[in-house]
Amino acid sequence: YDFTNCDFEKIKAAYLSTISKDLITYMSGTKSTEFNNTVSCSNRPHCLTEIQSLTFNPTAGCASLAKEMFAMKTKAALAIWCPGYSETQINATQAMKKRRKRKVTTNKCLEQVSQLQGLWRRFNRPLLKQQ
């Protein structure tokens, strides 16, 4: 999906109002310095591409994020404010459904959510130079 035509300001507002709080809840009890950010993004569409991938695609050691509260609200935001997004997800989701597991919070998942927090922060500051 090409995130170029999304309403970035509305997605940002939804992130600041509620998604960010759900990410913090997920990470509660974890030190903010515990994980190094290794995933980066260069502009808002790129950030959403990376956010979408880390949130919804199962990875080795962490297959459960798509069922978390922040993921549900992220999906809602992308579907509402990115034209055509929900239609493009139909085939992708069917392929992944069988691989999803529910609510197993591993250290790998915590690391992945820490990366997500970094991507969202970057999404919110699009004019900053890439480091």
């Epitope: 509305k10 507002a13 939804a14 600041l16 109002s17 509620t18 709080k21 759900d22 913090i24 809840t25 798509a66 069922k67 509260m69 549900m72 609200k73 999906k75 809602a76 935001a77 579907a79 509402i80 997004y85 929900s86 239609e87 997800q89 139909i90 992708a92 989701t93 069917q94 459904k97």
Partner: antibody
């Protein structure tokens, strides 16, 4: 304007199944999660689960796991909630409720009129 | 599962009086994830207050919401006849979504 219109009242025998529909209009159906909430007579509200019409993804309340199935038909903008192995305690009004961002806060912003399901032998 | 406990179960108030409804949450949640709904007999619930303190469209200013963490409050500064109803709090912080048992505001 957003409208959620539910199917009519049902009377079922214990052990049977019931399928309630909720037809949506006035918004982009595929882009909003739909929730199902029930209310037993004189009781409070109980969340049963939700479905994302765009791809059919579901999240169920563990209390109903195995008994509830939520589906959707995008061609008619309708979501369905089927509850099986009915017992008398399932007698309730069943509501569909859209999940949406209001002032960028996420909540159930529109509700159907409710469908009364009576389970009686 | 997050348990929502509302008190009192029934609140008897005279028109014009102040009403305070409480919602206690079993584990701390963000204020953005606490909502209130109003329900009248024979009707569907209606969104009333979003995110602890944001009034839904058309809700009069005599209603207000406050709180944080595990304790939240809905206040009606001067009760009008149309305010008599059941009010439910609800959390959207973790699955399963849960509601309080409701507070019925009735005429004294």
């Amino acid at each position: 304007q957003v409208q959620l219109v539910q199917s009519g009242a049902e009377v079922k025998k214990p052990g049977a199944s019931v399928k309630v529909s909720c037809k949506a209009s006035g918004y982009a159906f595929s882009s909003y999660w739909m929730n199902w909430v029930r209310q037993a007579p004189g009781q409070g509200l109980e969340w049963m689960g939700q479905i994302f019409p765009g791809d059919g993804e579901t999240n169920y309340n563990g209390k109903f796991k195995g008994r509830v199935t939520m589906t959707r038909d995008t061609s008619t903008s309708t979501v369905y909630m089927e509850l099986s192995s009915l017992r008398s305690e399932d007698t309730a009004v069943y509501y569909c409720a859209r999940g949406g961002y209001v002032n960028f806060l996420y909540a159930m912003d529109y509700w159907g009129q409710g469908t009364t399901v009576t389970v009686s032998s | 599962e997050i348990v929502m406990t509302q008190s009192p179960a029934t609140l008897s108030v005279s028109p014009g009086e102040r009403a305070t409804l409480s919602c206690s949450v079993s584990s701390s949640i963000s204020s953005s994830n606490l909502h209130w709904y109003q329900q009248k007999p024979g009707q569907s619930p209606r969104p009333w207050i979003y995110g602890t303190s944001t009034l839904a469209s058309g809700i009069p200013a005599r209603f207000s919401g406050s709180g944080s963490g595990t304790e939240f409050t809905l206040t009606i500064s001067s009760l009008q006849s149309e305010d008599f109803a059941v009010y439910y709090c609800q959390q959207w912080s973790s699955y399963p979504l849960t509601f309080g048992g409701g507070t019925k505001v009735e005429i004294k």
